[in-house]
Structures are given as structure tokens and as C-alpha cells.
């Protein structure tokens, strides 16, 4: 069977006027997962995103991440998109005063 991922979007200051947004997927099985950033619903090119490897997390499941740098104040234009085992979900960037957005996809 499959185990759906926990998806968590975080933000961190990158440089003046920019922030790095990171989308992490964890505790999923099997290992094949799509995780990518969109701006205004349009997929970002590969060369503007950074990916972590899909790694075992020690529980028989896997974890990975994708990050991109964006302009501060434009967070609402960006979403992290996930596909896994025939399911999909979309995850927004949290506002500045909230640093975590969790979603366990079922």
C-alpha cells in the first residue's frame, strides 16, 4: 500500500527583499513523488528550484524537499504542488507571522 506524505511549507530570510520558501514532504511511501513550485499557477523552471534527494527517514518511508527564492511580499503568488500515488495537493506559503503549514494528504 501507499503512505501519503506530510507536507510542510516554511519560509526563511534569504537576503534583503528576498525570502527562501521550502516545501518538505515526509513520511511517504513509495518513494516516487512530484514536488514543485508554481507562481500564479504556472510551474517554475527547474533551474529556479533546488531539490533535495529522496531519502529514507528510518521508518520505512521517505522524505524530500524543494526550495526557491522569491521576492518578499509576493508569497501569495506561490504554491507548492505535490503528486504522490495518484493523489495531489497544493500548499500555500505561510504568512510572515506563521512559519509552518502542515498538511497530511489523505
Amino acid at each position: 500500500g501507499s503512505v501519503p506524505p506530510m507536507v510542510n511549507v516554511t519560509r526563511s530570510e534569504a537576503s534583503e527583499g528576498n525570502i527562501t520558501v521550502t516545501c518538505r514532504a515526509s513520511s511517504f511511501y513509495p518513494r516516487n513523488i512530484t514536488l514543485t513550485w508554481r507562481q500564479d499557477g504556472v510551474s517554475l523552471s527547474h533551474d529556479t528550484q533546488q531539490w533535495g534527494d529522496v531519502l529514507p527517514d528510518g521508518n520505512g518511508t521517505y522524505q524530500t524537499w524543494v526550495a526557491t527564492r522569491i521576492c518578499q511580499g509576493e508569497e501569495q503568488r506561490f504554491t507548492c504542488y505535490m503528486e504522490h500515488s495518484g493523489n495531489h495537493s497544493t500548499h500555500p506559503v505561510p504568512s510572515g507571522n506563521s512559519h509552518h503549514h502542515h498538511h497530511h494528504h489523505h
Epitope: D53, T64, V66
Partner: antibody
Framework: QVQLKESGPGLVAPSQSLSITCTVS????????VNWVRQPPGKGLEWLGM???????DYNSALKSRLSISKDNSKSQIFLKMNSLQTDDTARYYC??????????????WGAGTTVTVSS | DIQMTQTTSSLSASLGDRVTISCSAS??????LNWYQQKPDGTVKLLIY???SLPSGVPSRFSGSGSGTDYSLTISNLEPEDIATYYC?????????FGGGTKVEIK
Amino acid sequence: QVQLKESGPGLVAPSQSLSITCTVSGFALTGSGVNWVRQPPGKGLEWLGMIWGDGNTDYNSALKSRLSISKDNSKSQIFLKMNSLQTDDTARYYCARGAHYGKRWYFDVWGAGTTVTVSS
Amino acid sequence: DIQMTQTTSSLSASLGDRVTISCSASQGINNYLNWYQQKPDGTVKLLIYYTSSLPSGVPSRFSGSGSGTDYSLTISNLEPEDIATYYCQQYSKLPPTFGGGTKVEIK
């Protein structure tokens, strides 16, 4: 077994619109992207666009104004519609499943293609 | 758009030969490169992904290498079923773009 099969009109008159259907089996459209690629006679391959599992679409900007990609998950079908066809749209049109895993993005299974001729 | 160039549009080789097909990008593509094989009947098959990874079912005589702007596909021991046209494809930037193809024929 993953399979994709295109079906189209064969012949389209200039200025008319083109509709092609891609029927898939062996995987769920809710969790896989499907791409459209075409190949004019004697030429190379050109990516037209794709539709993701959630129905979101990405298009080749050179053709975006004339293209529309949609799908029916329950029928396992993806639809390509292109408007205002000209003779240089004559090509073999392929649908292909996209595999997008981190740094890897490739078209792992292709349909056999359907030939479309634009002529009066 | 990123332009992909395959300078050799066709080549002839003998069975058992080592064949190398080159592909260059108009800018660096960070190994975001795939290779496809198109048979004379139009059938298209994924051959190599992410510069050098081999999908299951693809014979080990096929290999890929490269970095930056320059990439290559090698067939180490040409067999009759390898008669086809080979296309490189980048996905570093949208839209994904293909090279013009290299047709491999038997001498």
C-alpha cells in the same frame, strides 16, 4: 501496463480548429502529468504543453494563445484543442506521460501518435 | 527558449561499432537532459534521463554523459535494432526543447 493512444481527425481545413484525444490506461490521471508533443514531417519534436494531476496546465508560450489542454479523469482522457490551424501545423501529434521526480523530469511512455494534415 | 543543437543530422556505422551522438545547449542546463529514440515507424522511447540515468528495460550498451552545455549519447556496440533517430531534450527552462535529431544508419 501503461499505455497512451491518440485519436484525431486526420484532416483539418486551414483556419479551423483541431481536437485530439489521448486515452490512457495503466495509471491514474489524478497523479500524473500528461504532455503533448508534435513533429512536423521530416522535422524534430516540439513540446506543446502539459496538464498536471490537479488539472493545472503549462503551455509553450509560442503557442499558448491557440492551445487548450483539458481532461476527464473518469474517462482517462486528455484533450488537446488548437485553434486557427495553418499548413505548418501539419504534424504527428503525440501524448506522453510525464515523470517529474525532483531533478528528474522525463517523458517515460509515449503514444504512437496521430497524424494531422492541414489542407483545404 | 534554450536551443538544443545536434550538429550531426545523420551518421552511418557498422554493426558492433561504438557510436557517439553529441548535443549542445545554447546555455548551461545543469544536467537537466534526456535522450529519446524514435524508430522509423515513429515510435518514441525514453533512452536516458537526467544526463546519464538508464530507465529499466533499456540495454546497458546505451550510456549518457556531459555537463554544462555539452552532452553525448554513446551506443557501445551497435545492433540492428538501434537503427533510429535520437533526440536530446533539455528541461532546465520551460519550455522543454529538443535537438534536431541524429539519424543512425547501418553501413
